[in-house]
Interface confidence: low
């Protein structure tokens, strides 16, 4: 039925060919010496690419970005749901393809993959009930969220569900497990001696990725998981519920996938693109699928389940939320209700479904084989007012601005690729499949990846997570941009950001965080080792303790939410567009790549200190098993010295020599790649970065020296300490080798 041909990069390759053929013919005809030709080619292209001063280029690009356009695009993208795998999201892909072409990109292609997705059964809805001793359902959770005003007749609103939950109807006693973090289960099992085996657990959303919660519950022997949003985490004091404010109403529910993919992409085709000829695993061998039913609910329904809880009292105040319930842990209901049980009714199905990425290309004039990528997803759970369309609207405006410059005769030095990813919400599938399909090109040509999901999660200050290589780029760029914040009129973004989110280590500098996962940069950074970064406007973490933003992944995440409550003037969106776009511009257009390897040296020392201090909590074992970090500290010292010398050479070398320039830029580009271990981390083959990985306990968080960290985690409980400390030593040696090897890539080549 769907006979779309698979589009490839051949059109791009063909488009490049004539110029090179002509150039080659000239060389042969004229009998030029090869080096002379290369000099001529690069100097010619360079002057073509910079027909106005670099500063003016950047200024022209930034000045072209308009808040009003972002607002218009956001409105356009949020009128109907765009769930991955649906006709509506395919239509939006085609619209974006058409508009990017109009904006002036050289080519815009749709790339499709057939991946495993998950949907509720329309005729057999999911719900949870309390049943009495006769098996009668005396309470049922709601089947859908009450739609917001004005959206009552909108079709295709998928009801709240946990994507990839297996089907099942478990029943049993309830156990409240707080956030279902590793430490919460330690508290339950080790301190309180509560056994979750055979029980249905209820956990509050927040703190960690929901997939980790489900994994922890499975390991504890639970037969089902109920996830709910507690007002303590999703209702900020003093703010009204939607539609009168930005807080979560009692009937609001957070959707989301509950996979533990560890970077695999499509669960049926790990490591390879899910194309027409792909070999697909059976569902039993699929990567990362949960084995027990899972379902999300709002706090009205949670109240009904939690108010009857008996058993043990909660261990301390950190286990109590804001509902008027005792927050007893259980198992089971109290006194009069002890014969009542909880039953889950889950009928969702997983099926192979077609998804579409949109890939736009703006060919580089000087180094077309070097790629700077700006990517963000297009699929949403419902309207996607914030996630993802506040990001997609910004990408759209960035493409429009770049296109305007191109129409005026400008081209970037390097190629810029723009991506609208599909099925991010189902496990980062669109980006991962595309990267798997293009991995050989990306690992040879990928300069940087800038992520562009939600532009806002608050309106307080900037938030940046990136590779240390980009720290200086971000600092320098934000010093050039105007702050949108009240009270900082005429001041730089750097200034307001530093004031509101100061670095915990360096005074007078803003905080930049480690990259974790949970978004589309994952495959580029964690698997392929391409320098990556992300930026968005965020909340005040000091005063707003709630997790994410209250209406995350609910039906209430609408255009009106953004326009009324978060960013009426779209000034924060514009600032994020300037940061993301400015980073892309610099990465694609700077003669010398704007990476500073010395910043990596600084963090490597910090991370080595941190992991050493963790290990030193076990001084006796370190002595017994001869565990030493000397080699790692030595490698870090070598890295620091070599990076310092490289920076001196970078400052002083002849920038007009194209061979030297390319050599130095390649050393910078390949530095991130040098931190990749082809064997990957233990049991996580697609997390291959030795310095950073998503935390094994929270996919959203980044962990430094993750191999060593995981080997040390809970080591005192390991049954075979000798083997456990042997693994610590092995991980130290891998980290040492990797840091040393990376350092040597920066050494003078001859």
């Amino acid at each position: 039925m769907w006979n779309l041909l698979h589009e490839t990069d051949s059109a791009v390759a063909t488009a490049r060919r004539p110029r090179w053929l002509c150039a080659g013919a000239l060389v042969l005809a004229g009998g030029f010496f090869l080096l002379g030709f290369l000099f001529g080619w690069f100097i010619k292209s360079s002057s073509e690419a910079t027909n106005i001063t670099p500063k003016h280029n950047m200024k022209a690009f930034l000045d072209e970005l308009k808040a009003e356009n972002i607002k218009k695009f956001l409105h356009n993208f949020t009128q109907i749901p765009h769930l991955a795998g649906t006709e509506q999201n395919f239509q939006l892909a085609k619209q974006i393809q058409s508009q990017w072409k109009e904006f002036g990109l050289d080519s815009v292609e749709l790339t499709h993959y057939d991946v495993l997705l998950s949907y509720p059964n329309k005729t057999h809805p999911n719900y949870i009930s309390i049943i009495n001793e006769d098996g009668n359902e005396i309470f049922n959770t709601s089947l859908f969220e009450p739609p917001p005003a004005g959206y009552e007749n909108v079709s295709d609103i998928v009801p709240p569900f946990s994507a990839f939950s297996p089907q099942g109807m478990p029943e049993g006693d309830l156990v409240y497990v707080n956030y279902a973090r590793t430490e919460d289960f330690f508290k339950l099992e080790r301190d309180m001696k509560i056994n979750c085996s055979g029980k249905i657990v209820i956990a509050r959303y927040g703190k960690v990725f929901r997939g980790n919660k489900v994994k922890n519950a499975q390991l504890a022997g639970a037969t089902g998981v109920i996830l709910y949003s507690d007002p303590a985490d999703y209702f900020a004091p003093g703010v009204k519920s939607y539609p009168d404010g930005w807080n979560l109403p009692g009937g609001g529910v957070q959707r989301g996938n509950i996979l533990n993919l560890n970077g695999a992409g499509d669960p049926l085709t790990p490591g390879y693109p899910a194309n027409e000829y792909a070999y697909r695993r059976g569902i039993a061998e699929a990567v990362g699928l949960p084995s027990i039913p899972v379902h999300p609910i709002g706090y009205y329904d949670a109240q009904k389940l939690l108010e009857k809880m008996g058993g043990s009292a909660s261990p301390d105040s950190s286990w109590r939320g804001s509902l008027k319930v005792p927050y007893n842990v259980g198992p089971g209901f109290t006194g009069n209700f002890s014969t009542q049980k909880v039953k889950m009714h889950i009928h969702s199905t997983s099926e192979v479904t077609r998804i579409y990425n949109v890939i736009g290309t703006l060919r580089g004039a000087v180094e077309p084989d070097r790629y700077v990528i700006l990517g963000g997803h297009r699929d949403s759970w419902v309207f996607g007012g914030i996630d993802p369309q506040s990001g997609a609207a910004v990408v759209h405006e960035i493409v429009r601005s770049f296109g305007t410059l191109k129409k005026e005769g400008w081209r970037p030095r390097r190629t810029i690729l723009f991506a609208s990813w599909d099925a991010e919400e189902f496990g980062l599938l669109g980006s991962t499949e595309w990267a798997e399909e293009n991995s050989r090109l990306l690992q040879e040509r990928g300069v940087a990846y800038i992520n562009a999901d939600s532009s806002i999660e608050g309106n307080y200050t900037l938030r940046v997570d990136c590779t240390p290589l980009m720290y200086s780029l971000v600092y320098n760029l934000t010093k050039e941009l105007e702050s949108p914040d009240e009270g900082f009129e005429g001041k730089s973004l750097y200034e307001s950001w530093t004031k509101k989110s100061p670095s915990p280590e360096f005074s007078g500098m803003p905080r930049i965080s480690k990259l974790g996962s949970g978004n589309d940069f994952e495959v580029f950074f964690q698997r392929l080792g391409i320098a990556s970064g992300r930026a968005r406007y965020t909340k005040n973490w000091e005063t707003n303790k709630f997790s994410s933003y209250p209406l995350y992944h609910s039906v209430y995440e609408t255009y009106e939410l953004v326009e009324k409550f978060y960013d009426p003037m779209f000034k924060y969106h514009l600032t994020v567009a300037q940061v993301r776009g400015g980073m892309v511009f610099e990465l694609a257009n700077s003669v010398v790549l704007p990476f500073d390897c010395r910043d990596y040296a600084v963090v490597l020392r910090k991370y080595a200190d941190k992991i050493y201090n963790i290990s030193m909590k076990h001084p006796q074992e370190m002595k017994t098993y001869s565990v030493s970090f000397d080699s790692l500290f030595s490698a870090v010292k070598n890295f620091t010295e070599i990076a310092s010398k490289f920076s001196e050479r970078l400052r002083d070398f002849d920038k007009s020599n194209p061979i030297l320039l390319r050599m130095m830029n390649d050393q910078l580009m390949f530095l991130e790649r040098a931190f990749i271990d082809p064997l990957g981390l233990p049991d996580r083959p697609f997390y291959r970065h030795v310095i950073y990985a998503p935390s094994s306990h929270n996919k959203y968080a980044g962990e430094s020296f993750p191999g060593i960290y995981d080997a040390l985690f809970d080591i005192e409980s390991k049954v075979d300490p000798s083997q456990a400390w042997g693994e610590v030593k092995r991980q130290i040696s891998i980290a040492t080798f990797t840091v040393q090897a990376a350092a040597e890539t920066l050494s003078e080549v001859a």
């Epitope: 109907i80 006709e87 909108v154 295709d156 099926e351 479904t353």
Partner: nanobody, 127 residues
């Protein structure tokens, strides 16, 4: 009440034409893709054609391609199937069916989980 009501069926000679209609009510017709499905006497269900919510995409089963045309008028909440060059093997009860709420399962054409069906209209092609 949410419903689909087919009409336009009847007895027709081979080679002739027929136009089926399907009137929708009780839901936001313009937001959904819709299918025509048929069931020949003593046979199983057979998918015939699909039209997207805004009519920008249309797909047909191989054995009706070039002969049948699916269309819709969202202002009238009505779906149509224009059937030309009819053959004896087109004899069946024709049903219109709303696509499931989260959209067409792209890449598949066989096992749709339709959530709303019409009662069907009989088409008999006979000389």
């Amino acid at each position: 009440e949410v419903q689909l009501v087919e009409s336009g069926g009847g007895v027709v000679q081979p080679g002739r034409s027929l136009r089926l209609s399907c009137a929708a009510s009780g839901f936001s017709f313009s937001g959904y893709g819709v299918h025509w499905v048929r069931q020949a006497p003593g046979k199983g269900l057979e998918w015939v054609a699909y039209i997207s919510y805004d009519a920008s995409n249309k797909y047909y089963a191989d054995n009706v391609k070039g002969r049948f045309t699916i269309s819709r008028d969202n202002s009238k909440n009505t779906l149509y199937l224009q059937m030309n060059s009819l053959r004896a093997e087109d004899t069946a009860v024709y049903y219109c069916a709303k696509d499931p709420a989260w959209g067409l399962r792209l890449g598949e054409s066989s096992s749709y989980d339709f959530d709303i069906w019409g009662q069907g209209t009989m088409v008999t092609v006979s000389s």
